[in-house]
Interface confidence: low
Amino acid sequence: GSGVFQLQLQEFINERGVLASGRPCEPGCRTFFRVCLKHFQAVVSPGPCTFGTVSTPVLGTNSFAVRDDSSGGGRNPLQLPFNFTWPGTFSLIIEAWHAPGDDLRPEALPPDALISKIAIQGSLAVGQNWLLDEQTSTLTRLRYSYRVICSDNYYGDNCSRLCKKRNDHFGHYVCQPDGNLSCLPGWTGEYCQQPICLSGCHEQNGYCSKPAECLCRPGWQGRLCNECIPHNGCRHGTCSTPWQCTCDEGWGGLFCDQDLNYCTHHSPCKNGATCSNSGQRSYTCTCRPGYTGVDCELELSECDSNPCRNGGSCKDQEDGYHCLCPPGYYGLHCEHSTLSCADSPCFNGGSCRERNQGANYACECPPNFTGSNCEKKVD
């Protein structure tokens, strides 16, 4: 059923031990109850118990309190299950009967075995709270409480919403008091069948089959499936869509494995030389003064260029070179002379001529001789 009307009998008082007719019970009124629950009637009248009926065993004699879940085969509270939307209104008839023997069937009892009969009607909402009531007649008093609650898996104001919590392939949810689904953490969707992927998992490129998972579609990788997978064999390149190979700066070719920037990647030029890329794996080094070689790896001797004049001898030094001038000459390269024509500086028949610019004289050499003093024989 979708719900149950519960009636809790608490106390019945029949101090004189008499029937409704006023006749006393012998030896006392062995009391049991019949309960009839039906649709709302402005005036409760006999007729079918449309919502159900229930009887108790003998619960006591004359006056007695009724224990919860009383023994003797009865149950307290009494249960009247129903299998329809609770209408919110009802009529209730409670009859107290005397049982002279053990047979409690209606046809086995004399009509005058009735002790008392009460009838109530009204509105009753579904809820956990008990409504306490007491009905008194001239001879008897009955104290009881009642309520309507939904059966397991039924919810809502009228017990009309069926909801069974589950955690399996068909859904992952519990039920709220109104019968709506409340998804377990990690699940979403109308029936909580759709897992919530790992936070940040890319909407298009990732998916999941269980919560907090992020599985990548082909061509994507990474914890959140937001990194594309480049072309297989891509060496120095990246991608913005799967299977691309966009070369990093300085690289070329289908797989970005051709070095277009040898200078930057390998720094081949030595001794402060300037490097210029000149094609794939090709470069040119421009050497600083004093260096030579493909990579400017060789140091030049500055004396190799014979910088000293007038027979001066050249000496290499850390910071360059130094000319040792013969007597009568001076200057960085022994280019200045302290002699004049009067000193007969020209050898091998050379004729001397006075000069004023820089040097004091100049020798004009005969054939087969050269040098500033005609001191060198030409072969």
């Epitope: 955690n167 399996d168 992952h172 519990v174 709220q176 377990l184 953490p185 990690g186 269980k210």
Partner: antibody
Amino acid sequence: EVQLVESGGGLVQPGGSLRLSCAASGFTFTDNWISWVRQAPGKGLEWVGVINPNSGSTDYADSVKGRFTISADTSKNTAYLQMNSLRAEDTAVYYCARDNFGGYFDYWGQGTLVTVSS
Amino acid sequence: DIQMTQSPSSLSASVGDRVTITCRASQDVSTAVAWYQQKPGKAPKLLIYSASFLYSGVPSRFSGSGSGTDFTLTISSLQPEDFATYYCQQSYTTPPTFGQGTKVEIK
């Protein structure tokens, strides 16, 4: 690092009450369910109940329904187990555990012993 | 409630042995089964979830299999640190229920 730390266990007389706490850290408290699982001395594991700290939804084992109440304080990242009408058979080590999305318990506290005896 | 029945309740084995523990559910639980390891005085540790998935950080010598009502936990080569009590658990329906445990002892 995910951590669950229980406290509040001790000796209590039958019919008495006790409140256990489970302090959680290292994960988003409101995104996970927290279960209580108990283990009587020398016995196996028994699920007690569960709470969704985000919504307050709870569920209980039949053996404790009506006596035990699970609650949570999301500002303190702490779950509680309020135990009333305690019986001798409630004597056990009580663990709180993170109830993973699939209903598995992937992180457990160290446990706290509750002894019900007169 | 769904009953989970483990067998054997205890076993003796040596280091290097292959060990198999079985668990039977009283009704179909699909693959909603987990396995735990517990050592004396300690909390249980999750080993396997969804019947066959190895939980992170758990050595690969542990494996799980099964679906429906019959499930198995296998330790391919028993190590000294594996001597403990093992529990199965179903999470197919509430309440989640555990097996009674299998104690693995040193032979």
